[in-house]
Amino acid sequence: RGVFRREAHKSEIAHRYNDLGEQHFKGLVLIAFSQYLQKCSYDEHAKLVQEVTDFAKTCVADESAANCDKSLHTLFGDKLCAIPNLRENYGELADCCTKQEPERNECFLQHKDDNPSLPPFERPEAEAMCTSFKENPTTFMGHYLHEVARRHPYFYAPELLYYAEQYNEILTQCCAEADKESCLTPKLDGVKEKALVSSVRQRMKCSSMQKFGERAFKAWAVARLSQTFPNADFAEITKLATDLTKVNKECCHGDLLECADDRAELAKYMCENQATISSKLQTCCDKPLLKKAHCLSEVEHDTMPADLPAIAADFVEDQEVCKNYAEAKDVFLGTFLYEYSRRHPDYSVSLLLRLAKKYEATLEKCCAEANPPACYGTVLAEFQPLVEEPKNLVKTNCDLYEKLGEYGFQNAILVRYTQKAPQVSTPTLVEAARNLGRVGTKCCTLPEDQRLPCVEDYLSAILNRVCLLHEKTPVSEHVTKCCSGSLVERRPCFSALTVDETYVPKEFKAETFTFHSDICTLPEKEKQIKKQTALAELVKHKPKATAEQLKTVMDDFAQFLDTCCKAADKDTCFSTEGPNLVTRCKDALA
């Protein structure tokens, strides 16, 4: 049913080089290598990319040339396995090189590290950045692709090319300004924030694909596309979902050239078939390729058809419900998901999938009974609690965010999640709480009908990262329980967790709460992380501390930092007032 060309090519690498063009080809190969071998330097990867590109050009010139008929996995895998000192640098990943394709590629994929021990990607000073950008824009952008890809091994490759293009445009504009710093900082911060969200969203898609297969991803795509394109018919939505599934499967599987090529093909198809898809695509379709595909991926929802019948007519009142379900289960459930989703752009995809799952379970049970209509007749009413739960979550959390602001809201979440899973490492809890807390800024300011999909689908993506990090070193039964279930049930599972009663509180260690004057010169973000680390440790020491007790301690702590950082002799202030603070904390929590 898909839109993609299927003709065979004598040389796959020549075909992709021709389709993508040299610039995108090189960028994608660099991303692929950086995502597979995350410790290698830019120069090492750049050398390999140049060799692969030179080889691709020989195949373009003559598709029958030696090795041009080999698969991309074979060609890329052979390149990676030829790297000197592979075992010394990558340990057991080197064992992948003893395998044949496709097992070798599977092995490389299994060794991708979601949390590589790399230093944070630091942004150079504006002047320095502009100098190196002007000297060699290609190398500068290559470094950007390499640094992002190695830290985010599942980043959606064609979308990373888009962010690199954004980066390039910002630098071109700002490096010509007198005040480069004030031009660059807000713009690059904006790109960074969007890219980080893109990364966790894509990781969630790959998790869905890896853990639950293509069918689960396709269901996600049907719901999402139906919300965005409510005037497209089911056949059109199914075709788009099938193609989107293929694109994502390729990217998640490391087939980045195919993924980018197929994504471009899908964008082309959508723009050529706007009449049957959506009235909102034209603005996107006027843009060049990378911007077009990005724009289509977040295009506004089309206006819902005015004359849609009530959902009950087809899925509850129709006398042939069980006959339809028995005859073509997947298509019938897919139609239900389509019809429900196109009527509810105000629901999260996770919620829509939970409703479809509930509907399926109801039909499984009821269609086996003597009087099915009497049994499934109340199914839509049974959806109500499933809908109310996330609506209440949004209201409660957005109210709290509006009251506390982002930093205070992050702290509230940090306390909550440390109580739910105190065994989880403090850095992981702080990272998770900071990310979860950003949902307020990102979603709570949106119009009412956009809040729920924004909040829940973002939280689900962040919690997916929590699960991935926890999988590496499982320490909490609570987390294991929530992460073992289906993807769509994770967020409700985490929300329902309460204080872990099995946890033995941590001993109070004074050094955990001992601070030095160097904290005063840290950027605000780093200061916050230090304070949040202390907060998590306090909760681990006293999991049942009241909100009031914790507030008292944190206010005291903030006052202490403020006083000592303003003192003439900071070091003396920290060394004398620090122990007093620790004593007051212990007393307040006693």
Epitope: F234, A235, E236, D307, P309, D314, E320, F332, T335
Partner: nanobody
Framework: QVQLVESGGKLVQAGGSLRLSCAAS????????MGWFRQAPGKEREFVAG????????YYSDSVKGRFTISRDNAKNTVYLQMNSLKPEDTAVYYC????????????????WGQGTQVTVSS
Amino acid sequence: QVQLVESGGKLVQAGGSLRLSCAASGRTFSNYAMGWFRQAPGKEREFVAGSGRSNSYNYYSDSVKGRFTISRDNAKNTVYLQMNSLKPEDTAVYYCAASTNLWPRDRNLYAYWGQGTQVTVSS
């Protein structure tokens, strides 16, 4: 209101093929399930094939499954019935019908009907 006009019926040899068309006008075509029914002399009108609302699913009676194919073109507001390996017992007046139900088979669920087109299969 939906108006339906069938065409393409004629006399054909057993084993031959035929394609019937049904052009719709009036309301939004994709909002309707489209069905083909047939009525042989002295018999009840029977369901042959359906294309679910919103082009969601194609379904057939057991007697034509594997031989007939229903398809639709929403841009042209037309539904087709491709009939292969025709048999003398396929002789009937073929009617096109439209319904707001999802995947209807029962003739009573179809609110709009065409005038019919005659298909005769000779042995």
